[in-house]
């Protein structure tokens, strides 16, 4: 679903970024996945889209436009509150539910102008309209009165994952698709790569049959599986080579003999 920027920068106050990493250039990393992400552009003072390769990169990378704005635009939270507090609620909050043309099954949230509340609905995966949010919290912040907003829903603790030292965000809503949460993978001392490389192959929610590859952390190899076209998880690559480049580098051989290249 394309996001259109209709915030006015004039309302956002000082343009010194909130965090030093917001000044970093967009870095797609060396891998070849194609993940729609967002970064803060120091020159335009806006959050913009870029395609992330799936590994490495830097901290100026966000899964959602909203997350980018909240993190890097000074005063954005106040502006969002102002927008949500009544007369200046965005027009798209009043759009009727639209599941879209396609028929995937994706959990989303919309603002219901009759009940004046954000509610869950099923999105088909393409087109639709902008009254369509990945999280209940995001919907409430933008379209409901923020005074009544609870703390963020479904916060995922990532402590069960072994990471490579970088901050790991919850990838269950990556690329604007909300996917079923796989059970958390137990701590794996012999793997220090991307956490999604530990996830099981997930064929997704639709009815297509597309050849994809997933990384099997038990064998240290990438295997073929059938992907149905939507949903699933990030352990999903269009070629074996991309799969290996993204995941193989995290495998520790005999715990001390270095990284398998």
């Amino acid at each position: 679903l394309s996001e259109e920027a209709d915030d006015t920068d004039s309302e956002l106050g000082s343009m010194k970024p909130l965090h030093t990493f917001c000044a970093m250039k967009a870095d797609d990393g060396p891998c070849k996945a194609m993940i729609r992400s967002y970064f803060f552009n120091m020159y335009t003072h806006q959050c913009e889209e870029f395609i992330y390769g799936g590994c490495e990169g830097n901290e100026n990378r966000f899964d959602t436009l909203e997350e980018c704005k909240k993190t890097c635009i000074p005063g954005y939270e106040k502006t969002a509150v102002k927008a949500a507090s009544g007369a200046e609620r965005p027009d798209f909050c009043f759009l009727e539910e639209d599941p879209g043309l396609c028929r995937g099954y994706m959990k989303r949230y919309l603002y219901n102008n009759q009940t004046k509340q954000c509610e869950r609905f099923v999105y088909g995966g393409c087109l639709g309209n902008r009254n369509n949010f990945e999280t209940l919290d995001e919907c409430k912040k933008i379209c409901e009165n923020p005074v009544h907003s609870p703390s963020p829903v479904n916060e995922v603790q990532m402590s069960d994952y072994v990471t490579d030292g970088n901050t790991v965000t919850d990838r269950s809503t990556v690329n604007n698709i909300v996917v079923p949460q796989s059970p958390k993978v137990p701590r794996r001392r012999d793997y220090r790569g991307r956490p999604w490389c530990l996830q099981p192959a997930d064929s997704g929610l639709c009815k297509a049959s597309e050849r994809r590859f997933y990384y099997n952390s038990a064998t240290g190899k990438c295997h073929r599986f059938n992907y149905t076209g939507c949903g699933g998880n990030n352990n999903n690559f269009t070629t074996r080579r991309r799969c290996l480049r993204s995941c193989k580098t995290g495998l520790i051989k005999n715990k001390s003999k270095g990284v398998v290249k």
Partner: antibody, heavy 123, light 112 residues
């Protein structure tokens, strides 16, 4: 096998209403795994999407901004067909008009097309 | 609106030789996990368009395996590994990332 059969006049006078119908066989206009669209083609503008309708929990429609004030696409469930009405036509609306099915389940594309109807707007 | 730009607009080909058509979008069409909101169609002379490739790289049913689609972000390619006489016509790319749905201006493939 899905088939789309178009019907309607090939000549329309300026300022009048262009009306075309697309009869569906092999699928249902009310199917929740399809959407139904009108697309036109002219030498000057190439392939131009005009609008689409689809039934999920209720009927939805979307129209191109360029024709939004003049277009209506309606389903006729009793005859298993859908229609295009384009009001206040001008010579710029002269084109070959196609109806098409959007496959919502697997392919996510226009996988079946009508035979096309050349509509000329002229007095 | 997302603008789809194809090149070349005309492509003379020799039967048995490969052919390649480029399509560029004015914004990214990648949605998730390599799924791309882009389709390719072929309109043979005197016929309606037919779906060739959906979601960027998947052949529609009945489409010969000499046709393949690839690309990511904003740059996409349709390749014909060995052109046959029946492949002549106009090829169109189409995006469905956002309304309005838009098509490229077409690439006319003809035998030399």
């Amino acid at each position: 096998q899905v088939q789309l059969q178009q019907s309607g006049p090939g000549l329309v006078k300026p300022s009048q209403t262009l009306s075309l119908t697309c009869a569906i066989s092999g699928d249902s206009v009310s199917s929740d795994s399809a959407a139904w669209s009108w697309i036109r083609q002219s030498p000057g503008r190439g392939l131009e999407w005009l609008g689409i309708i689809y039934k999920r929990s209720k009927w939805y429609n979307r129209y191109a901004v360029s024709v939004k004030s003049r277009i209506t696409i309606n389903p006729d469930t009793s005859k298993n067909q859908f229609s295009l009405q384009l009001n206040s036509v001008t010579p710029e609306d002269t084109a070959v008009y196609y109806c098409a099915r959007w496959h919502s389940d697997k392919m996510w594309g226009f996988d079946d097309w009508g035979q096309g109807t050349l509509v000329t707007v002229s007095s | 609106d997302i603008v789809m730009t194809q090149s070349p607009l005309s492509l003379p080909v020799t039967p048995g030789e490969p052919a390649s058509i480029s399509c560029r979008s004015s914004q990214s069409l990648v949605f998730s996990f390599g799924t791309t909101f882009l389709n390719w169609y072929l309109q043979k002379p005197g016929q309606s368009p037919q779906l060739l490739i959906y979601k960027g790289s998947n052949r529609a049913s009945g489409v010969p395996d000499r046709f393949s689609g690839s690309g990511s972000g904003t740059d996409f390619t349709l390749k014909i590994s060995r052109v046959e006489a029946e492949d002549v016509g106009v090829y169109y790319c189409q995006q469905y990332d956002s309304y309005p749905l838009t098509f490229g201006q077409g690439t006319k493939v003809e035998i030399k």
